[in-house]
Interface confidence: low
């Protein structure tokens, strides 16, 4: 029985619940359905308290305490992150009138870089209006329990380490978590604390196995050529330093005077043959990679490459 929320490489939602309220108090952002997936394969967290209030200045706001929980259809319980020092419960203290017609949203994406050297979390503020007015700090608290079975509940007080996330890029913060290579298979427990102008959001405890969150670098050396039998061969190289085999998703569009065709294929090789190509057409291609034999996160797409076939295709090519 573990009170932490398991992070998996797909979208999940974080809701901040005021006292004596139910989850029905919260709404998904406009246009977003409960099972929306992120097109780039990352999971995302949206922190979204919604409030109706009359116009009130920031200076005279009273504080309300919020528990931030991950929303799940099956289980509406959530664990609270024990404070790294004093052992007090991590709760979210937010100013309930600050959010006039604003949704407080964050996209949170974490992954282990493809060379297995660095675990990164990005916290992107979608709460633009407030963060323009206030400096904000983001901390990530984490612990790698020596043997998780010995302490299956929230880690004891004083066990957390804290890293200051680098928010030098406006509205996006980078948190670097030092995870030794020998512990990549272990369970990393972590939580986020976001502070802005006296407003504090703190996530519940999250758990992740870094090895299951590997995000490779994009494939390299994407190029195209016409084969002897008149097919289009798309080739690329695996990114360097990836210590396991990858699967690849290739997406391409064919644009000719008569037709526009789009397709994407999943392959385990580093090349793909496209048949029935048309003379005088342009092909725009991108490829991305993901761990083949286990869970993981798709890499970013490679830079698009465009290949234009000749008006006449010779067999064999001249």
């Amino acid at each position: 029985f573990n009170l932490s929320y398991p992070i998996t490489p797909w979208r999940f939602k974080l809701s901040c619940m005021p006292p004596n309220s139910t989850y029905d108090y919260f709404l998904l952002p406009a246009g977003l359905s409960k099972n929306t997936s992120n097109s780039n394969g990352h999971y995302e967290t949206a922190v979204e308290p919604k409030f109706n209030s009359s116009g009130t200045h920031f200076s005279n706001l009273s504080k309300t305490t919020f528990h931030c929980c991950f929303r799940s259809e099956q289980d509406r319980n959530c664990s609270l992150c024990a404070d790294n020092i004093e052992g007090k419960t991590f709760v979210s203290t937010v100013n309930s009138l600050v959010f006039q017609q604003i949704d407080a949203n964050w996209n949170i994406q974490c992954w282990l870089k493809g060379d297995l050297k660095l675990f990164i979390c990005y916290v992107e503020s979608l709460f633009k209006n407030l963060f323009r007015n206030y400096n904000y700090k983001v901390h990530l608290l984490y612990v790698l329990p020596e043997v998780l079975e010995d302490s299956p509940l929230v880690p004891q007080k004083g066990s957390f380490q804290m890293v200051h996330c680098n928010c030098s890029v406006h509205e996006c913060c980078e948190c670097l978590v030092p995870v030794p290579t020998a512990k990549l298979n272990d369970t990393l427990l972590m939580c986020l604390k976001i502070t802005s102008g006296g407003v504090i959001f703190q996530s519940p405890l999250m758990s992740v196995q870094p090895i299951n969150m590997v995000k490779p670098d994009p494939p390299l050396g994407l190029h195209m050529e016409i084969t002897d039998d008149g097919n289009l061969k798309i080739s690329w190289s695996s990114p360097p330093l990836v210590p396991f085999p990858l699967q690849y998703q290739v997406k391409y569009s064919e644009n000719s005077t008569t037709v526009i065709r789009e397709a994407d294929k999943i392959v385990s090789a580093t090349s793909l043959l496209v048949d029935s190509i048309l003379p005088g057409s342009s092909y725009e291609v991108q490829v991305r990679g993901k761990r083949l034999d286990g869970p993981g996160i798709w890499s970013d797409w490679s830079t698009p490459r465009v290949f234009t076939t000749q008006d006449v295709i010779y067999f064999p090519p001249k």
């Epitope: 404070d83 020092i85 660095l118 700090k137 804290m162 890293v163 200051h164 913060c173 502070t195």
Partner: antibody, heavy 120, light 108 residues
Framework: EVQLVESGGGLVQPGGSLRLSCVAS????????MHWVRQTTGKGLEWVSG???????YYPGSVKGRFTISRENAENSLYLQMNGLRVGDTAVYYC??????????????WGQGTMVTVSS | DIQMTQSPSSLSASVGDRVTITCRAS??????LNWYQQKPGKAPKLLIY???SLQSGVPSRFSGSGSGTDFTLTISSLQPEDFATYYC??????????FGQGTRLEIK
């Protein structure tokens, strides 16, 4: 002028208690994280405790449970309550300000220090 | 905890010399490193923050560089008032905030 002035140091027996104070002037005290750092004679610097603008407190293992940091923003004052003092706690204690420059913290303003001697 | 190791622990130099002090972290700390100067009987003074940013009022002969685990403080041309003890300090993974053991810079 931005300034931090410590007081409250002195001679105390092992197991005794002492309360250090730090008065800030020349800046908006409640906007800054504040810390205590100590330096034993002829030795290096050791961080002792910190308190952020939210009132959350931070300690290293060597003093946790014995020292308590607090702040009184209305009085521009920082405090360090030291209980169960040990001979190894003998040091000059500095009060220091910790602003955030972007997201990089540093001790940019220090007090002159107050001497704490623990001896029987 | 992240350990900070400075080298050398002491060095002698002359006015006008170029001096380099190094600081190594036991694990990557990105660029969350600060440098301080302390003269006898005085409080430390912040020289460099975020590895390479010069604190306001600090002479430009002081510079910092490095990222990850290895960092350097350089004094391009030593002045008489620069003879002091220098400390590095990490603010990446806290608590605790940790300092190097110090480098004492003496007149040759």
């Amino acid at each position: 002028e931005v300034q931090l002035v410590e007081s409250g140091g002195g001679l105390v027996q092992p197991g005794g208690s002492l309360r250090l104070s730090c008065v800030a002037s020349g800046f908006t005290f409640n906007k800054y994280d504040m810390h205590w750092v100590r330096q034993t004679t002829g030795k290096g610097l050791e961080w002792v405790s910190g308190i952020d603008t939210d009132g959350d407190t931070y300690y290293p293992g060597s003093v946790k449970g014995r020292f308590t940091i607090s702040r009184e923003n209305a009085e521009n004052s920082l405090y360090l309550q030291m209980n169960g003092l040990r001979v190894g706690d003998t040091a000059v204690y500095y009060c220091a300000r910790w602003p955030w420059s972007g997201f990089y913290g540093a001790f940019d303003i220090w007090g002159q220090g107050t001497m704490v001697t623990v001896s029987s | 905890d992240i350990q900070m190791t400075q080298s050398p622990s002491s060095l002698s130099a002359s006015v006008g010399d170029r001096v380099t002090i190094t600081c190594r972290a036991s694990q990557s700390i990105s660029s969350y490193l600060n440098w301080y100067q302390q003269k006898p009987g005085k409080a430390p003074k912040l020289l460099i923050y975020a590895a390479s940013s010069l604190q306001s009022g600090v002479p430009s002969r002081f510079s910092g560089s490095g990222s990850g685990t290895d960092f350097t403080l350089t004094i391009s041309s030593l002045q008489p008032e620069d003879f002091a003890t220098y400390y590095c300090q990490q603010s990446y993974s806290t608590p605790p905030i940790t300092f190097g053991q110090g480098t004492r810079l003496e007149i040759k």
